[in-house]
């Protein structure tokens, strides 16, 4: 089948990185600068994406693959294929139409992007607040007051949370 197809259509022999040039008796010509073809048999090469302004080049365009962009420091990608860059904020803030604003009391954001989220309501799980929340961190819930031994003078704090994939020392 492949052989039959190539007899019928000489363009099918043109590999990625070339195009089938109708102006030159359907010879396979290399893609011109700033263009690419990622599959064989193409009759044109596509113009490369240009990373410009707030966009920075993550991967250069080659004759067989398009450029890839990401955002300059202080911004992060949004949209399909990083079609937009959104301003970073500090932890403890969220981005509004007027820029970065501190999280309201009772909410937190532990990232440079996204919105402020409400602190966990420990009492919904029948637990008590062990560590108060801040603008940057959620509250830490502890055992419920009923779980505490009568007459206990202190609460042993929980072991520090381990990062995923780390085994205890």
């Amino acid at each position: 089948f492949e052989r039959t197809r190539s007899l019928q259509d000489p363009c099918s022999n043109c590999p990625a990185g070339t195009f089938c040039d109708n102006n030159r008796n359907q010879i396979c010509s290399p893609c011109p600068p700033n263009s690419f073809s990622s599959a064989g048999g193409q009759r044109t090469c596509d113009i490369c994406r240009q990373c410009k302004g707030v966009f920075r080049t993550r991967k250069e365009c080659s004759s067989t693959s398009n450029a890839e962009c990401d955002c300059t420091p202080g911004f992060h990608c949004l949209g399909a294929g990083c079609s937009m860059c959104e301003q970073d904020c500090k932890q403890g803030q969220e981005l509004t139409k007027k820029g970065c604003k501190d999280c309201c009391f009772g909410t937190f954001n532990d990232q440079k992007r996204g919105i402020c989220r409400p602190w966990t309501n420990c009492s919904l799980d029948g637990k008590s607040v062990l560590v108060n929340g801040t603008k940057e961190r959620d509250v830490v819930c502890g055992p419920s007051p009923a779980d505490l031994s009568p007459g206990a003078s202190s609460v042993t704090p929980p072991a520090p949370a381990r990062e995923p994939g780390h085994s205890p020392q």
Epitope: D46, T72, F75, A80, G81, S83, Q87
Partner: antibody, heavy 123, light 106 residues
Framework: EVQLVESGGGLVQPGGSLRLSCAAS??????????VAWIRQAPGKGLEWLAL???????RYSTSLKSRLTISRDNSKNTLYLQLNSLRAEDTAVYYC???????????????WGQGTLVTVSS | DIQLTQSPSSLSASVGDRVTITCRAS??????LAWYQQKPGKAPKLLIY???NRATGIPSRFSGSGSGTDFTLTISSLQPEDFATYYC????????FGQGTKVEIK
């Protein structure tokens, strides 16, 4: 409030040069992520992008006009400039400066535009 | 350079009509497309960015859709202030504008 105000337009002889200015306020041309462009519109015609400069002085030019254009800026005056040489009658147009993106989300579109300055090339 | 072709070049419509303008790119451009409205003697005004996001303060009757090569601007119910010229613009590789679509009163 973001504002862009163009100046420097007027009547120019064919073969001459012009230097347009665009005074920016409400933001700094040197702030990371900021890019500003020149776009023109001939009478009764569509829009044509000419050139763009970003905060770290990366410059892009229209392929067809590259040899006649120079975009620059003066951070101390927060002002953008466009120099256009070897003027022809077909360069007669309203010249706009425009800022890329918006306050928080930036991309390859123009959110803030000046009112434009008219350049007439005629003898 | 990437070419953008708008259709129709002009159209006549009445207040309350649903209006659709299309923009076709000479190659795939993802969603790197914006729409502008321009009234005589005024600078263009951004309506839609990233193909489908309404710019700040733009009424919900304006919507954009599409990706790749084919894009659409729809005005769901034309208002008197919407009679103007509309342009699409790509930002995928440098910047180019469509030739414009003039929306006139029928």
């Amino acid at each position: 409030e973001v504002q862009l105000v163009e100046s420097g337009g007027g009547l120019v002889q064919p073969g001459g040069s012009l230097r347009l200015s665009c005074a920016a306020s409400g933001f700094s041309l040197s702030t990371s992520g900021v890019a500003v462009a020149w776009i023109r519109q001939a009478p009764g015609k569509g829009l044509e992008w000419l050139a763009l400069i970003d905060w770290d002085d990366d410059k892009r030019y229209s392929t067809s006009l590259k040899s006649r254009l120079t975009i620059s800026r003066d951070n101390s005056k927060n002002t953008l400039y466009l120099q256009l040489n070897s003027l022809r009658a077909e360069d007669t147009a309203v010249y706009y400066c425009a800022r890329e993106g918006s306050t928080t989300v930036v991309g390859d579109w123009f959110d803030y535009w000046g009112q434009g300055t008219l350049v007439t090339v005629s003898s | 350079d990437i070419q953008l072709t708008q259709s129709p070049s002009s159209l006549s419509a009445s207040v309350g009509d649903r209006v659709t303008i299309t923009c076709r790119a000479s190659q795939g451009i993802g969603t790197y497309l914006a729409w502008y409205q321009q009234k005589p003697g005024k600078a263009p005004k951004l309506l839609i960015y990233d193909a489908s996001n309404r710019a700040t303060g733009i009424p919900s009757r304006f919507s954009g859709s599409g990706s790749g090569t084919d894009f659409t601007l729809t005005i769901s119910s034309l208002q008197p202030e919407d009679f103007a010229t509309y342009y699409c613009q790509q930002g995928y590789s440098l910047w180019t504008f469509g030739q414009g679509t003039k929306v006139e009163i029928k």
